[in-house]
Structure formats: C-alpha cells, structure tokens
C-alpha cells in the first residue's frame, strides 16, 4: 500500500499509468510517465514500492499529469505507480494506486534461447518448429539464417516467446534469433546461441559437393519461411537432427547458405 489513507477502490477509482516512448528503453532516453485519472484531479503523485511519500508531485487541475524522467539511467528503472487526489479529500488521502508500470532501462535485453520443438529428431516430411524464448512479453522476435541477409521470419508475440515453423525438407541450416521492443526507439536483445539443423547422418563427409560454402543455386527468396539449401536429391535422409553448434574451424562442416537470392 502506498499510504495508510487509501480509501476503498469504489470510492476513488484508480488512474492509468503509461510510459512514452516505451516501458523498455536504453539509457539516456527521455521518458515521460503519464498518469490519467478517471476524473479531474488536483494533485498527482508518482510512487515507487515501499515508499509512503510520492517520488514526484504534479499539481494540475486536469485528468492528466506528466512526469518527466530525463536521460534515464538503469537505476531509474523499476516499478512505478501513480495516484491522484482532490482538495476536498481528507489530508493524506489518495486514490487507489494505478496498476504497476515496470520501467526497464538497459543497453541490451537478455539473450534468448533457441530450441527445436517437439524434439531433436524430426522425421522426413515433418515440419520443424523453432522456439525463440526471451524473458519479456510483447516483443518482436526475429529468426535469422546464416548466409541470408534479411530475416527469415518475424513474429510479434504477446508471450515471452515466438514459434517459427520451417518446412522439413527445407530446414537444414544454421539459425539464430533476436527479440526487440516492438517500436522505435528499439532495444535489442543479445543474439541467441546458434542452432544447427541437419539431416540425420550428415557430417563433413556426407556433404554434397554442390553445397560447398558460398555455392548457391536458384531457390526461394529470403522471405520464404522455408528458404532451402541446394538439392540433396541423391541423399536419402531418415530424419532431421537439431543440435547446438559446437566451436569449429573454417575447414569443418558448416551448412551451406541457402540459395536465397536470385542475384547472389
């Protein structure tokens, strides 16, 4: 509770608290916290958890107060709530507090994980689902394939993860993902560890000459969720093996980039 004098919810309904440009920002950005009351108020207060006194006051005879946080630092991140009051209320009486707003001030968001679902081995013809999992909701998730400039797939998700489906026959390759805030100014996560998808039994010795690094044949554009690698027509796969990439030298096997661009 913010103060001992907070009345019942029905008495003075809670205000709404929002942040501009976003609730996740990089250090140095100017952030405006907007507190909107359901009725004209006289004083607005911005509170942090466990503090009786407001962090900031705004005396405005309207339904909206703005609290300016200039060039925010990570220390200014955390949970905020706002309340409002009117002059005809008793001393120290505030409205119900707004829902919490969590402000995150960070240079980069935590690294997501990239895993294959439902399991590590996928039979021929089956689709492969890759899950890019971060820690924050309402982010945009981006799936990249090594050797392709533009992202392979892009998802906005209300959950802290996004699932990307790859067509089984077109799946072999090396993948990584990011997530970032859904609108500018963007805050970016670290890149995930890479995930290699390869045909079961395939290794340096099984790799067809036609798919040497840098060699590309005609194929779908990079926006195709199943941008495919050069044809393995003479190879009969039993299933797909999905594995985290281990450190390797340039001479060791690395999936050829997909034939993603007509002009490459």
């Amino acid at each position: 509770d913010i103060t001992p004098s907070v009345p019942p919810a029905s008495y003075h309904p809670k205000p709404w608290l929002g942040a501009q440009p976003a609730t996740v920002v990089t250090p140095g950005v100017n952030v405006t916290l907007r507190c909107r009351a359901p009725q004209p108020a006289w004083r607005f207060g911005l509170f942090k958890p466990g503090e009786i006194a407001p962090l900031l006051f705004r005396d405005v005879s309207s339904e909206l107060a703005e609290f300016f946080l200039e060039e925010v630092t990570p220390a200014q991140g955390g949970i905020y709530r706002c309340c409002y009051r009117r002059p005809d209320w008793g001393p120290g009486v505030w409205s119900q507090p707004s829902d919490v707003l969590e402000l995150l001030v960070t240079e980069e968001l935590p690294r997501p994980s990239l895993v294959a679902l439902p399991g590590p081995v996928v039979g021929p013809g089956a689709n492969v689902s890759l899950r890019c999992a971060g820690r924050l909701r309402n982010m945009s998730f981006v799936l990249y394939r090594e050797g392709v400039a533009a992202p392979l797939q892009y998802r906005h998700s209300a959950q802290p993860w996004a699932d990307f489906t790859l067509l089984g026959a077109r799946a072999p390759g090396t993948y990584s993902c990011y997530y970032h805030t859904p609108s500018a100014p963007y805050v970016l996560s670290q890149r995930s560890e890479v995930l290699v998808i390869s045909w079961e039994g395939e290794g340096p010795e099984a790799r067809p000459a036609s798919s040497a690094p840098g060699m590309q044949a005609p194929g779908p554009p990079p926006s195709d969720p199943g941008a495919q690698a050069p044809s393995l027509s003479s190879f009969r796969p039993r299933g797909l093996v999905l594995q985290p990439l281990l450190p390797q030298t340039q001479d060791s096997w690395d999936p050829a980039p997909p034939p993603s661009d007509p002009g490459v």
């Epitope: 240079e107 980069e108 690294r111 981006v142 990249y144 090594e146 050797g147 392709v148 400039a149 533009a150 992202p151 392979l152 797939q153 892009y154 090396t174 990011y178 970032h180 963007y186 970016l188 670290q190 890149r191 560890e193 890479v194 690094p213 554009p221 990079p222 926006s223 969720p225 990439l245 450190p247 390797q248 030298t249 340039q250 690395d254 980039p257 993603s260 661009d261 007509p262 002009g263 490459v264």
Partner: antibody, heavy 117, light 113 residues
C-alpha cells in the same frame, strides 16, 4: 559505450599481405556479425563480407573471395581481416562495422592501406 | 547482385531548403516475412565513417534529427531532408540490406551554396 577500434594505417608493397584488426568493446561480441567495407579514395562503399564471431561462419562478396580472409578471436573480442596479393587497387580505407538486425549501426574509424613499391 | 542506383550524384543547396534524393534497386527489397523494405540510408561526412540515418526504408535511427525522412517501397526509395542545415554537408548512400552481397549506391553528394 559501443566502440570499434581499428588498427593503424598500413603501407605495403605490391604482392604483400596485410592483416588489420577491429577490437570491439561495450557490447557482447558474439551477439553481432562483424562486417567489413572497402572505400577507395573519393569513391563509394563496397561490401567485402562478414564473420559471425560465435561460429566463425563467413560470407564473402565473390569479388573479394580470393582477396580477403575474415577471422575473429572471441577471447579478445577482436575481428581481423587479411588482404593478400596486394595491388594498387587495394589502396583504400577499410571499415569494420557491427551488424544489428536493423543496420550496420556502429563503425570503426577505418584502417588506411596504401600499396606502393 | 542487386544494383543500387542513386540520383542525382550531387546537389547544391542553400541552408533551410528542402532536399530529396532518389535510390532505385534492380530488385525488390521488400521482405514479405515482416513487410519491411530492407533499404538503409547512410550519411558520410568527410574523414568519417558512414553513419546510419534510416533503416527499413523509413525508420529513423535513434538520435537522428526528424528533418531526415525515408520513404518508398519495393524498388524506389527517397531520402528527404526537410530543411537542410550546414552540418548536413555529406555524401548520402543507400544500401541493399536484403540479400548478399550487400550493395551500396554510388552516393549523392550534398553541397551548400
């Protein structure tokens, strides 16, 4: 803050090789692809290629495939580019740049290479 | 390879003037995966490395003044400076960020009268 510090200017003879460095700081080196771009005096920009430091995967512009070799050292957060069989055409400023999902958002100050006998 | 063609090659303007420059690509740069155009604009001042102005054809990089606006889709793109300032003297490059090899336009040099 993010910084890409490139090694100093190089003067080399035709036929020789040079290896330049790009030391990254202020970010997680293995989370970003490192690109290299060439700019000849008074000319435009040419993309050479990139390296993914976390896997050592490289992608080259075909034009530079036999000219440039990209490597990276995770332990020192440093990307390298070696240019071989130098000719006067290789006299240029070479930039390293960090690649985010949006653009090449941070660039080194450039390494000037002069090839002269 | 995707060829990027910029015009004009140079522009001489007075401070406060509105400027537009064009960039055309030989192939569409629209990524159907997220409906974004993978076209980036860079500004390069003398003796400095390039600096990102606009990515995804129209998204302004953080810290870039709002007088810079990118527009266009597919193969035709435009960079507009609403009111040119003395510090905008530079060469402006567009870049294909859609497919490898990444390719740059030849640049538009902005000069002040």
């Amino acid at each position: 803050q993010v910084q890409l510090q490139q090694s100093g200017a190089e003067l080399a003879k035709p036929g020789a090789s040079v290896k330049m460095s790009c030391k990254a700081s202020g970010f997680t080196f293995t989370s970003y692809w490192m690109h290299w771009v060439k700019q000849r005096p008074g000319q435009g920009l040419e993309w050479i290629g990139y390296i993914n430091p976390s896997t050592d995967y490289t992608e080259y512009n075909q034009k530079f495939k036999d000219k440039a070799t990209l490597t990276a050292d995770k332990s020192s957060s440093t990307a390298y580019m070696q240019l071989s069989s130098l000719t006067s055409e290789d006299s240029a400023v070479y930039y390293c740049a960090r690649r985010s999902p949006f653009a090449m958002d941070y660039w080194g100050q450039g390494t000037s290479v002069t090839v002269s006998s | 390879d995707i060829v990027m063609t910029q015009s004009p090659s140079s522009l001489t303007v007075t401070a406060g003037e509105k400027v537009t420059m064009s960039c055309k690509s030989s192939q569409s740069l629209l990524n159907s995966g997220n409906q974004k155009n993978y076209l980036t604009w860079y500004q390069q001042k003398p003796g400095q490395p390039p600096k990102v102005l606009i990515y995804w054809a129209s998204t302004r990089e953080s810290g870039v003044p709002d007088r810079f606006t990118g527009s266009g889709s597919g193969t035709d793109f435009t960079l507009t400076i609403s009111s040119v300032q003395a510090e905008d003297l530079a060469v402006y490059y567009c870049q294909n960020d859609y497919s490898y090899p990444l390719t740059f336009g030849t640049g538009t040099k902005l000069e002040l009268k």
